[in-house]
Amino acid sequence: APTSSPAKETQQHLEQLLLDLQVLLRGIDNYKNLKLPMMLTFKFYLPKQATELKHLQCLENELGALQRVLDLTQSKSFHLEDAGNFISNIRVTVVKLKGSENKFECQFDDEPATVVEFLRRWIAICQSIISTMTQ
């Protein structure tokens, strides 16, 4: 069977991560957003810079907070079949991309962000890394 190159696999994982983050943002950032103002009280921390795969450590660090926000939405207005499983899948993808031995020390912005701002920023980061890879 043909095997895909490491670069191709990395791109596929990034595209999957991008898709997952977009699904989350669509679920949160629509009119239902107003229905769940409690979600907007959660603080998220954004990386000072994120241009390489190792910077995904900064995303992994925030997945626990993301899980807690999604827990609020269960049986309410935002329907994910299994939020815990969804976050778990994102975590697996992130580890595949950054490597499990990554000891990168994440530097965060001083200003925290809402969950909507957080997801938008990480979507943009993923898009930027993908576009760099495909050049």
Partner: antibody, heavy 117, light 108 residues
């Protein structure tokens, strides 16, 4: 102009029922939570709970669960706070406030409720 | 139940800087909001999401956050700033909570 206008001062006896109102104007009343806040004489603010007028979804503070009932009539852009049986300890100023995506950004002028025993 | 802790009172002379703190275990992960309440009036939002100022609020009002403490800073304090100030945040459940309030007295 975005505003919330509350019903007037109420003087009641212990055991009476009461329903106070909060009418919104200048914005889409349906799609913003309306919170209720109690302020007893000389005391601080206490969050009582909140209601989403579009479908009357409500969340109560544990301290007020079962003590009051929140409701809304979206057709007339009005939220309500009611008591089945008032007590002297319900004497307070009651504020309604709109929760935008950031905070309680618009407040009513308050309704003073006095309950004599 | 979850509590936000504020000092009962702060006094400052006109033109000076007033700092009002609010502490709570959840504040590293929950935004804080600040309200001003003048005597006999409804509260007014002065700071949201720790540091943001609504339109119409003077630049003298600012907010900051560090760990479990958020701070409302009022620089060049004016007589009209004499009021009660309340911090508000959310607890770990689906509930909001206010601090007990701080009375800011502008001396003189």
């Amino acid at each position: 102009e975005v505003q919330l206008v509350q019903s007037g001062t109420e003087v009641k006896k212990a055991g009476d029922s009461l329903k106070i109102s909060c009418k919104g104007s200048g914005y889409n009343f349906d799609t913003y939570w309306i919170g209720w806040v109690r302020q007893m004489p000389g005391r601080g603010l206490e969050w009582m709970g909140t209601i989403y007028p579009a479908d009357s979804d409500t969340r109560y503070s544990p301290s007020f669960q079962g003590q009051v009932t929140m409701s809304a009539d979206k057709s007339i852009s009005t939220a309500y706070l009611q008591w089945g049986s008032l007590r002297a300890s319900d004497t307070a100023m009651y504020y309604c406030a709109r929760f935008s995506s950031s905070a309680y950004d618009i407040w009513g002028q308050g309704t003073m409720v006095t309950v004599s025993s | 139940s979850y509590e936000l802790t504020q000092p009962p009172s702060v006094s400052v002379s006109p033109g000076q800087t007033a700092r009002i703190t609010c502490s709570g275990d959840a504040l590293p992960r929950k935004f804080a909001y600040w309200y001003q309440q003048k005597s006999g009036q409804a509260p007014v939002l002065v700071i949201y999401q720790d540091t943001k100022r609504p339109s119409g609020i003077p630049e003298r009002f600012s907010g900051s956050s560090s760990g479990t403490t958020v701070t409302l800073t009022i620089s060049d304090v004016q007589a009209e700033d004499d009021a009660d100030y309340y911090c508000q945040s959310a607890d770990r459940s689906d509930s909001y909570v206010f601090g007990a309030g701080t009375k800011l007295t502008v001396l003189g």
